[in-house]
């Protein structure tokens, strides 16, 4: 009956953690004698190829300083402690502690048997590191050129994390990769870049980080912050201003970042009706008269700049009873 070595084609272990490389000789055959078990790294330099051996009488040996006896152990193999007990070598599973990047590679588990001869199996050990993720907005001031408005950082992953962005905005991502402080790891930074405008301010975009150490992708929301000058509109005009009306008000509606620092009401004619009183963002009209047949201008300033809106007013002699007209500027 033929025997075979059962190993996993690939084993993944966490950087700094412990991993087991399973290796079993199957099936159990009466009279099949396992004389030696060895673990080798065929791709390593010659003086580091022999990783471990288990001799039925002498037990385990770990000749190479890397990984060495401090970090290696046979999980189940047992030597014959007395002459009347047989060694148990069918399970040659090897445990490797304190995983380093240098541990990554092919490992061959080999059973020297009689009478079948030598049989072996190979496992690829992959050393992975779970990255730490972080995303943040980068406050920018509006401009005509694309600039990074958010960044997402996946620190010290192995292999490098994959970063993408979820957003309805018109954007592009710029990615950089640098070596992590832990040897063999990579820190990935993705910058969410767009032409910054008020439309992007306060919008939430999502950084999506994928890594094989995650059960599912990490989703990190980021609220953008764009400093832009006031975007102004005027509301309150209902196309039914008539002589003597007393309940009229104009509002200066503003979107800006940061908040406005000042509002200024004026007219294009340069004549400002005395019955119109500016109260910050509102213009309160005590009584409409013929001087209101003009264009009102609201000018708003903030730390970034200035914005203005105009509203043309038409003063009727009598109320318009045909129904309310359109409002807004």
């Amino acid at each position: 009956q033929d025997v075979r070595v059962q190993v996993l084609p690939e084993v993944r272990g966490q950087l700094g953690g412990t991993v087991e490389l399973p290796c079993h000789l199957l099936p159990p055959v009466p009279g099949l004698y396992i004389s030696l078990v060895t673990w080798q790294r065929p791709d390593a330099p010659p003086d580091h190829q022999n990783v471990a051996a288990f001799h039925p009488k002498m037990g385990p040996s770990f000749p190479s300083p890397k990984p060495g006896s401090q970090r290696l152990s046979f999980v189940s193999a047992k030597q014959s402690t007395r002459q009347d007990t047989e060694a148990e070598l069918q399970d040659a599973t090897l445990a490797l502690r304190g995983l380093t990047v240098e541990d990554e590679g092919n490992y061959t588990c080999e059973f020297a048997t009689f009478p079948k001869g030598s049989v072996r199996g190979m496992t690829w050990l992959r050393v992975i590191a779970k990255p730490q993720n972080h995303a943040e907005a980068q406050e920018v001031t509006f401009s005509q050129d694309p600039v990074p408005v958010a960044r997402c950082i996946s620190k010290e992953g192995r292999p490098p994390a994959r970063i993408s962005w979820l957003s309805s905005l018109d954007w592009e991502a710029k990615e950089t990769q640098v070596s992590g402080t832990l040897a063999g790891t990579v820190t990935v930074t993705s910058r969410f870049t767009l032409v910054p405008s008020g439309r992007a301010d306060g919008v939430t975009v999502t950084c999506k980080v994928e890594h094989e150490s995650f059960e599912e992708p990490a989703l990190i929301p980021v609220t953008l912050s764009v400093r832009y000058p006031p975007e102004v509109s005027i509301s309150g005009y209902d196309d039914n201003w008539y002589l003597g009306r007393t309940d009229a008000t104009l509002s200066c509606d503003v979107h800006s970042n940061p908040e406005p620092t000042g509002y200024d009401w004026s007219t294009t004619s340069g004549i400002f009706p005395t019955s119109a009183v500016a109260q910050g963002s509102q213009l309160v009209i005590h009584a409409v008269d013929s001087l209101f047949n003009t264009t009102f201008v609201c000018t708003v300033t903030n730390a970034v700049g200035m914005g203005r809106a105009e509203q043309v007013i038409f003063v009727r002699e009598t109320p318009n009873t045909a129904g309310a007209g359109a409002t807004g500027g």
């Epitope: 009466p30 009279g31 004389s35 030696l36 080798q40 022999n50 020297a112 030598s118």
Partner: antibody, heavy 116, light 107 residues
């Protein structure tokens, strides 16, 4: 302590047969193969074959298949090798040995001289 | 069968010298090689197994190296008790085969 005690020196004629013994002690006889190795002066070592006392299974080097017969008697923990149709080429020291990782335990050897 | 060739039948060394005994396999045997020492009138004793692993109680002046087809037993700081014959053996494939031996003589 593991011991393999072999039978003494044999002097015999060409064409004859001889049966030599290897008595084992100090371990479970039925659990390990007993191997036989031939050594001629200046000719190195040759593996003849092995017998597994647990089920009397045997395994031979093809070169010695017609020459040697390996058996074991569990009741006396003794392995035997019978050599037939002897010629001067068979004159050698024959060792029984126990495989524990390597051939870790050896008998003292049986010297066979075939001469007319 | 796999042929294990020890090309040097004899080697001569002085006490304290370093000497290397070589063994070549006719085909790849991995690291499945043992080195034995046989003193005159005695049975062989294991020195090295799996090409480079030193057997229990063997002085560390004995080291084994090699894999595949080329193997070396190195004795550094040769002592008078090292006067013996040295054999390599492969256990990769049935039948097991031995080298023809290298006799170390002390000047």
């Amino acid at each position: 302590e593991v011991q393999l005690q072999q039978s003494g020196t044999v002097l015999t004629r060409p064409g004859a047969s001889v049966k030599m013994s290897c008595k084992a002690s100090g371990y479970i006889f039925t659990s390990y193969w007993i191997h036989w190795v031939k050594q001629r002066p200046g000719q190195g070592l040759e593996w003849i074959g092995a017998v597994y006392p647990g089920n009397s299974d045997s395994n031979y080097n093809q070169k010695f298949k017609a020459k040697a017969k390996l058996t074991a008697v569990t009741s006396t923990s003794t392995a035997y090798m019978e050599l037939s149709s002897l010629t001067s080429e068979d004159s050698a020291v024959y060792y029984c040995t126990k495989l524990v990782g390597t051939f870790d335990y050896w008998g003292q050897g049986t010297t066979l001289t075939v001469s007319s | 069968d796999i042929v294990m060739t020890q090309s040097q039948k004899f080697m001569s060394s002085s006490i304290g010298d370093r000497v290397s005994v070589t063994c070549k396999a006719s085909q790849n045997v991995g690291i499945n090689v043992v080195w034995y020492q046989q003193r005159a009138g005695q049975s062989p004793k294991t020195l090295i197994y799996s090409a480079s692993y030193r057997y229990s109680g063997v002085p560390d002046r004995f080291t084994g190296s090699g894999s595949g087809t080329d193997f070396t037993l190195t004795i550094s700081n040769v002592q008078s008790e090292d006067l013996a014959e040295y054999f390599c053996q492969q256990y990769n494939t049935n039948p097991f085969t031995f080298g023809s031996g290298t006799k170390l003589e002390i000047k």
